[in-house]
């Protein structure tokens, strides 16, 4: 015999999600074919800098690889070149539009793409892994209060549906490697470890895979053991920013405290021609502190919107807490507005104009 | 072995005023978060209030926001809660529980779980 | 309420006013005792708690599902979202012998 009841629960409006990127659009291309990549600016409206990223991972020009802010192009492409391909927003790396492209082994003849010329499994439907909410993939390190439970998640598809493995420091990874074991729920693409301790810090890998590709993310560990300390600043945060005259910018700095932290922005300024005072210390303007209304949240951002030659300068992220201070710094450089910057580094291209 | 044990109910008048405490013990105090869920006679459980001990940090329901105060002593491993301008209607068996998050970077929300709770301890409002 | 004699499969369901996505968990409750928990995050068994409890879910439909019913499990089960503050309990389901 089976039983059903109901009780109702609750609960207030929260925060909405913002607007899914476009459509997953899902490509097939022969082996030695063109991959050309098009994303037009949203509504028409200007671009901004652009930057875009393969399987996670920035995308850096080359011969072979041509970046544009609305195209991308791969030259002579292999199975290799197989993947998940977004186009972002540089400040905000917000998905503009994102692609789950599969190079075949045979060239492509053009018109059949329906696939009914290949294997019951390929065509269009079918593809290598992507994830199904890149934006949600952004965030990489997790600072966690021991005794705490943690869920690292890799939600993903593909066709045929791929597998989820993990990894912990490049190894594979098993319940019974930690005392109290772990959870997996592959249909939620998760990895759960209760009450955690700092034997559990590390890097962990998810590996989605299936017979046209694999992609995977890496997720860093860090387990809080409750000693007093000052706050602790994300590594590369705020980071240095190239902008255009009259663009907006974002700095963000990552707080992690025990103690409730103080957040203050400040601009480096100088005074009389000197950058620090008779005693050493620098001379600096408070651009943003906490007030009655602040979010811890709000504060770790910065934003200068149309920003002036004047914008340009040193930036200094510092947070205070009971035990003590922490601070991080980071140069904006601002470009006349008819200059296009052309900047290609390990986090891939960016292009204004 | 984790142990949450509270004192400090009884029977006060309506207006008065009155402090439970939650002493823990068997895990990290510092670690997690002391919540506060109460349940009226033969009424269903309500959630009144929780601390994080190491930062202070507090949230209360609306019932009874101005009106209690949740507080620690961490070098005591215990929580407290204090209730003043107490009416008839917060008559109530008081429990707390351990709270721990599970922290999750995919989603924008951290889900609290309360995993061990006391015995609870009865306050009454009444003239 | 709900009534079942022992070796009966029991399901109780739980509905959120709004999308809460898996940020629910069950309590089970006997009189006089404080509550227990069973489950968090809508699907996952907490340690030491028997495999024949079950939970699934996500967006505003929840369940709680005892595969075959013990005397143990005649109690009170209380579903809770903590997706927002203040978290929020349904009203609870009793679960009685036939």
């Known amino acids: 015999e089976s039983l059903g009841t109901e009780q109702r629960v609750v609960g207030r409006a929260a925060e909405v999600p913002g607007p899914e990127p476009g459509q997953q659009e899902q490509l097939v291309f022969g082996s030695g074919d063109a991959v050309e990549l098009s994303c037009p600016p949203p509504g028409g409206g200007p671009m901004g800098p652009t930057v875009w990223v393969k399987d996670g991972t920035g995308l850096v020009p080359s011969e072979r690889v041509l970046v544009g802010p609305q195209r991308l192009q791969v030259l002579n492409a292999s199975h290799e070149d197989s993947g998940a391909y977004s186009c972002r927003q540089r400040l905000t790396q917000r998905v503009l539009c994102h692609f789950s492209v599969r190079v075949t082994d045979a060239p492509s003849s053009g018109d059949d793409e329906d696939g009914e010329d290949e294997a019951e499994d390929t065509g269009v439907d079918t593809g290598a892994p992507y994830w199904t909410r890149p934006e949600r993939m952004d965030k990489k390190l997790l600072a966690v209060p021991a005794a705490n439970t943690v869920r690292f998640r890799c939600p993903a598809a593909g066709n045929p549906t791929p597998s989820i493995s993990w990894l912990k420091n490049g190894r594979e990874f098993r319940g019974e490697h930690r005392i109290g074991g772990i959870k997996l729920r592959h249909q939620q693409w998760s990895l759960v470890m209760e009450s955690v301790v700092p034997s559990d810090r590390g890097n962990y890998t998810c590996v989605v895979e299936n017979k046209f590709g694999s992609i995977r993310q890496t997720y860093t560990l860090d387990v809080l053991e409750r000693s007093p300390h000052r706050p602790i600043l994300q590594a590369g945060l705020p980071a240095n920013q190239t902008a255009v005259l009259g663009s907006d910018v974002e700095f963000h700095c990552k707080v992690y405290s025990d103690a409730q932290p103080h957040i203050q922005w400040l601009k480096h300024v100088e005074v009389n021609g000197s950058k620090v005072g008779p005693d050493g210390t620098p001379y600096v303007t408070v651009l943003k502190t906490a007030g009655a209304n602040t979010t811890d949240k709000e504060l770790e951002v910065l934003s200068l919107h149309n920003v002036t030659f004047e914008d340009a300068g040193e930036y200094t992220c510092l947070a205070g807490n009971s035990i003590g201070f922490s601070h991080h710094s980071a140069w904006l450089v601002v470009l006349p507005a008819e200059e296009e910057l052309v900047e290609a580094d390990e986090a891939g291209s960016v292009y204004a104009g | 072995e984790v142990q949450l044990v509270e004192s400090g109910g009884g029977l006060v008048q309506p207006g008065g005023s009155l402090r439970l405490s939650c002493a823990a013990s068997g895990f990290t105090f510092t670690s997690t978060g002391i919540s506060w869920v109460r349940q009226a006679p033969g009424k269903g459980l309500e959630w009144v209030g929780r601390?994080?001990?190491?930062?202070?940090?507090?949230n209360y329901a609306d019932s009874v926001k101005g009106r209690f105060t949740i507080s620690a002593d961490t070098s005591k491993n215990t929580a407290y809660l204090q209730m003043n301008s107490l009416r008839a209607e917060d008559t109530a068996v008081y429990y707390c529980?351990?709270?721990?998050?599970?922290?999750?970077?995919?989603?924008?929300?951290?889900?609290?779980?309360?995993?061990?709770w006391g015995q609870g301890t009865l306050v009454t409002v009444s003239s | 309420e709900a009534s079942g004699g022992s070796g009966d499969r029991v399901t109780i369901t739980c509905r959120a006013s709004q999308d809460v996505s898996t940020a629910v968990a069950w309590y089970q409750q006997k009189p006089g005792k404080a509550p227990k928990l069973l489950i968090y995050s809508a699907s996952f068994l907490y340690s030491g708690v028997p495999s024949r409890f079950s939970g699934s879910g996500s967006g505003t439909d929840f369940t709680l599902t005892i595969s075959s019913l013990q005397p143990e499990d005649f109690a009170t089960y209380y579903c809770q979202q903590s997706y927002t503050t203040p978290p929020t309990f349904g009203q609870g389901t009793k679960v009685e012998i036939k």
């Open positions: 529980a351990r709270t721990y998050g599970i922290y999750d970077l995919y989603v924008d929300y951290t889900e609290y779980v309360m995993d061990y």
């Open positions: 601390i994080y001990p190491t930062n202070g940090s507090t």
